[in-house]
Amino acid sequence: SRLRQEDFPPRIVEHPSDLIVSKGEPATLNCKAEGRPTPTIEWYKGGERVETDKDDPRSHRMLLPSGSLFFLRIVHGRRSKPDEGVYVCVARNYLGEAVSHNASLEVAILRDDFRQNPSDVMVAVGEPAVMECQPPRGHPEPTISWKKDGSPLDDKDERITIRGGKLMITYTRKSDAGKYVCVGTNMVGERESEVAELTVLER
């Protein structure tokens, strides 16, 4: 087939962007290319071609008409992590090929088990009280908040400081007594620790 004057090699006009997606959620890595004849698009992850519904109708990855890669759900296990990695799209026609920028797909996770649950604390009125927890492993790293008797703790109270996994009450009042729960949160959701009881004794 001879070269036609109006034909031109592929060029990527929309590059994929880095993504952080929760396990089980859908996701799209965008890619759009121009060229004449219209280029075919293939995706590669870590140098290996990515299988899509074009290869196996049961695949959870679909190659969209635009060239974008659509994940029906992000698959991510304790060991096998087939969707996580660095992707590129490659557009080809008989005049050549164009390769997109790298795009990393990271999977957001939040494990169930707290690395450290808070323990019961007993203090006298006016004394400081400290509770400590280490939330479940997660990506992105979970933020920590606390609940008292089922309601979010008022951290605007100047006596209360939350730093890392530590809850510090500089001087306790009788009203501080109750059931405390540590909460770890990221884009996946939230996890609550076991309950710890703060007992405040009269002097």
Epitope: E48, R49, G77, R79, S80, K81, P82
Partner: antibody
Framework: EVQLVQSGAEVKKPGASVKVSCKAS????????MHWVRQAPGQGLEWMGW????????EFPQKFQGRVTMTRDTSITTAYMDLSRLRSDDTAVYYC???????????WGQGTMVTVSS | DIVMTQSPSSLSASVGDRVTITCRAS??????LNWYQQKPGKAPKLLIY???SLQSGVPSRFSGSGSGTDFTLTISSLQPEDFATYYC???????FGGGTKVEIK
């Protein structure tokens, strides 16, 4: 089509070694852990260990440590299981199995019968 | 190691029966439990993953339940092709239960 195709049956003498291969096709080989499971005649399923095809990392239960070796060749998308110092009670069907992202063995090889007999 | 105990080791049932197989873990495994079916001379086949999720292509008469240490596989109405051996597996340490053979009464 996603499939695992294993090498053929083997007959070995006690003390020898056996190497079973498992050719993967239809999916990204390095994205999924590969496991080996065996089944002695009339018995249940026994997990032997895994290999991460991406980097070659392996893990085996205590029972098989020092006697089993798992390797892979990513260029031909094939995993291997080598069992040494064979005994008669190693007579079994050996399966390779892919671990899905749902933490289950969703694709299995057809099995390789290994007979250890003097 | 987490030990998986399956019961019963065998059972006899008729076509149309409701069949229940149980699996107990020696310590909590959350929902990390899978169920497989195996027929003589064949490789096992995944039925249920994550305790209760039905694998694609598996008939809806199969269902799984439980979390922590106690799990159940239920076949709501036994069909002739369901006579086989069933195995549970925990996907933390990957060990299998001893199996339950479902035979024709």
């Amino acid at each position: 089509e996603v499939q695992l195709v294993q090498s053929g049956a083997e007959v070995k003498k006690p003390g020898a070694s056996v190497k079973v291969s498992c050719k993967a096709s239809g999916y990204t080989f390095t994205g999924y852990y590969m496991h080996w499971v065996r089944q002695a005649p009339g018995q249940g399923l026994e997990w032997m260990g895994w290999i991460n095809p991406k980097n070659g990392d392996t893990e085996f239960p205590q029972k098989f440590q020092g006697r089993v070796t798992m390797t892979r060749d990513t260029s031909i998308t094939t995993a291997y299981m080598d069992l040494s110092r064979l005994r008669s009670d190693d007579t079994a069907v050996y399966y390779c199995a892919r671990e899905s992202g749902d933490d289950a063995f969703d694709i299995w090889g057809q099995g390789t019968m290994v007979t250890v007999s003097s | 190691d987490i030990v998986m105990t399956q019961s019963p080791s065998s059972l006899s049932a008729s076509v149309g029966d409701r069949v229940t197989i149980t699996c107990r873990a020696s310590q909590s495994i959350s929902s990390y439990l899978n169920w497989y079916q195996q027929k003589p001379g064949k490789a096992p086949k995944l039925l249920i993953y994550a305790a209760s999720s039905l694998q694609s292509g598996v008939p809806s008469r199969f269902s799984g339940s439980g979390s922590g240490t106690d799990f159940t596989l239920t076949i709501s109405s036994l069909q002739p092709e369901d006579f086989a051996t069933y195995y549970c597996q925990q996907s933390v340490g990957l060990f299998f239960g001893g199996g339950t053979k479902v035979e024709i009464k």
